[in-house]
């Protein structure tokens, strides 16, 4: 389906508002340090050019690819070399190498200040004064901090952001109305960003076969009444959408996502009974709703898998003739029967089945060799079941903060070379699995927990790839996508690690501690805990608990004192000395 002008095609398909939003997101994700005004200028220039192409597709440069047009535009930025260093070298390359170069320079942890939320009245004034600029600023700030954010979904977040201000800036108590909505958007946005980052990592590091396998498993759980052929079609289309978005082709991605939503809504009867309410919604909401739709009910009386996948005389013929399709069918059949399993577990089972066939179909008696293949699945199933059970028990016993601390200690002992801020961020997020998943019924716990942990551990992998410090982390991150979580779970105390020298400065605190929010206080304490474990990796739980309890008492005491700073100055060294003695 070729068009004389790709930019005109996408402008017409998407409409001006979405076109401009997506171009702004694309530019902000590539040039993460550029000021807002610079990006707005570039977007306006691209939009004006697109309009000339809509008017006349044969006009000069309208036949150029989007990568060429956007790359040329990005390369006009005057301060490219000063701001981005070697990224400026991308501009000397031709497409498609230039775009690949830009993609490689996306920074998952950009050195940007945390977003500070102004007073509600200040925000409402800004919203009323210039709504368009206010919303563009939101897209820009989120996109530059999350360079792999799923662009069409970010437009949906922006629409919700706009709706929140439109409603709450009229309310009697603006803050009571607005702040919970903004908190929800922030938390959902961070989760959405992390989930998409795993999809992109899956595609970029492990290839589209890995992504397709993930999608077959997940869509088969969601749509157990759909035939394999239907699921395969959805998987192919979904893979194209995410490949485009992860590759920076945001206009094509958004356009194809809209087409996929249209297709699903036109074919509900052969997909799922749960799509109805999604399909009545406007585009952005509809696509979001379809992505989040609950699992349909499983068909009654699904037959045993053994007949076709173990007992049949044709198992090896199927495997030899159409390996990926046959394994895809197996994965589809297993997943639609097991909404209670995590996608990662389902993928491990498919991998185990594949390995068995690879071995047995070359054996003298293949059937005899693979006859017990389903029995081999049992330990693979029990491992995450036991892990979820044990960790939920620990979470219920400790509560979220102390559960996070247990994970901080556990992971610092496993990989002490990892930077303290990364260990704190990742362990805090791992700890959130408790509140998110442990309250769910048994049948939903494992898919919730393990698939969430995969997303969090991907963040560790992405940050570690930028600054590699641990061979163990590299190994767990690169060897197998589906075995990442079991790989990290299996890591023990790193015996080769040389403990970090004690630095009193790390454990010196000031009165500013008292004015921090509860979350910020927790982060400070957890940072100290990681440093403590790095200093004494063999410290027992009891020793660490004693030090942390003393720390909490010391902070509480000084924050109640009349002269807080003097208290910290006097009590701090005593706390450090007592801690060193306790850990000796």
């Amino acid at each position: 389906d070729t068009h004389k002008s790709e930019v005109a095609h996408r402008f017409k398909d998407l409409g001006e508002e979405h076109f401009k939003g997506l171009v702004l997101v694309a530019f902000s994700q590539y040039l993460q340090q550029c000021p807002f005004e610079e990006h707005v200028k570039l977007v306006n220039e691209v939009t004006e050019f697109a309009k000339t192409c809509v008017a006349d597709e044969s006009a000069e440069n309208c036949d150029k690819s989007l990568h060429t047009l956007f790359g040329d535009k990005l390369c006009t930025v005057a301060t490219l070399r000063e701001t981005y260093g070697e990224m400026a070298d991308c501009c000397a390359k031709q497409e498609p190498e230039r775009n690949e170069c830009f993609l490689q320079h996306k920074d998952d942890n950009p050195n940007l200040p945390p977003l500070v939320r102004p007073e509600v009245d200040v925000m409402c004034t800004a919203f009323h004064d210039n709504e368009a600029t206010f919303l563009k600023k939101y897209l820009y700030e989120v996109a530059r901090r999350h360079p792999y954010f799923y662009a069409p979904e970010l437009l949906f977040f922006a629409a919700r952001y706009k709706a929140a201000f439109a409603e709450c800036c009229q309310a009697a108590d603006k803050a009571a109305c607005l702040l919970p909505k903004l908190d929800e958007l922030r938390d959902e946005g961070k989760a959405s960003s992390a989930k998409q980052r795993l999809k992109c990592a899956s595609l970029q590091k492990f290839g589209d076969r890995a992504f397709k396998a993930w999608a077959v498993a997940r869509l088969s759980q969601k749509f157990p009444k759909a035939e394999f052929a239907e699921v395969s079609k959805l998987v192919t289309d979904l893979t194209k959408v995410h490949t485009e978005c992860c590759h920076g082709d945001l206009l094509e991605c958004a356009d194809d996502r809209a087409d996929l939503a249209k297709y699903m809504c036109e074919n509900q009867d052969s997909i799922s009974s749960k799509l109805k309410e999604c399909c009545d919604k406007p585009l952005l909401e509809k696509s979001h709703c379809l992505a989040e739709v609950e699992n349909d009910e499983m068909p009654a009386d699904l037959p045993s898998l053994a007949a076709d996948y173990v007992e049949s005389k044709d198992v090896c013929k199927n495997y030899a003739e159409a390996k990926d399709v046959f394994l895809g069918m197996f994965l589809y059949e297993y997943a639609r029967r097991h909404p209670d399993y995590s996608v990662m577990l389902l993928l491990r089972l498919a991998k185990a089945y594949e390995a068995t066939l690879e071995k047995c179909c070359a054996a003298a008696d293949p059937h005899e060799c693979y006859a017990k293949v389903f029995d081999e699945f049992q330990p693979l199933v029990e491992e995450p079941q036991n892990l979820v059970k044990q960790n939920c028990e620990l979470f219920e016993q400790l509560g979220e903060y102390k559960f996070q601390n247990a994970l901080l200690v556990r992971y610092t002992k496993k990989v002490p070379q990892v930077s303290t801020p990364t260990l704190v961020e990742v362990s805090r997020n791992l700890g959130k699995v408790g509140a998110k998943c442990c309250k769910l019924p048994e049948a939903k716990r494992m898919p919730c927990a393990e698939d969430y942990l995969s997303v969090v551990l991907n963040r560790l992998c992405v940050l570690h790839e930028k600054t590699p410090v641990s061979e163990k982390v590299t190994k767990c991150c690169t060897e197998s996508l589906v075995n990442r979580r079991p790989c990290f779970s299996a890591l023990e105390l790193d015996e080769a690690y040389v403990p970090k020298a004690f630095n009193a400065e790390t454990f010196t605190f000031h009165a500013d501690m008292c004015t921090l929010s509860e979350k910020e206080k927790q982060v400070k304490k957890q940072t100290a805990l990681v440093e403590l474990v790095k200093h004494k990796p063999k410290a027992t739980k009891e020793q660490l608990k004693g030090v942390m309890d003393n720390f909490a008492a010391f902070v509480e005491k000084c924050c109640k004192a009349d002269d807080k700073e003097a208290c910290f100055a006097e009590e701090g060294p005593k706390f450090v000395a007592a801690s060193q003695a306790a850990l000796a």
Epitope: F228, A307, K313, D314, K317, N318, E321, M329
Partner: nanobody, 123 residues
Amino acid sequence: EVQLVESGGGLVKPGGSLRLSCAASGRPVSNYAAAWFRQAPGKEREFVSAINWQKTATYADSVKGRFTISRDNAKNSLYLQMNSLRAEDTAVYYCAAVFRVVAPKTQYDYDYWGQGTLVTVSS
């Protein structure tokens, strides 16, 4: 176990049309390869047409352009639309199924068979 039952056979004039149906029971067969074979009096059973899970069809040269195979997975059924019938199409038509990703063309590859339905083309 899969049970197959054909229907739709009968007497038809040359140039006429018939639609054969095959209903499967016992388990869903949407991912199975399904096929039609035929056996004329005193002859070997021969391949007519097959369809795979993707609804990709293959045909014997003798029926290409005249016969169309299709399936309705919701009804767990297979069909054969036969147009421009000739006297040499007279035979007992059998429906067959097997769990294969690639639809085979040889009868020995199929595990499940119907009892057949007679098609007679005569003026």
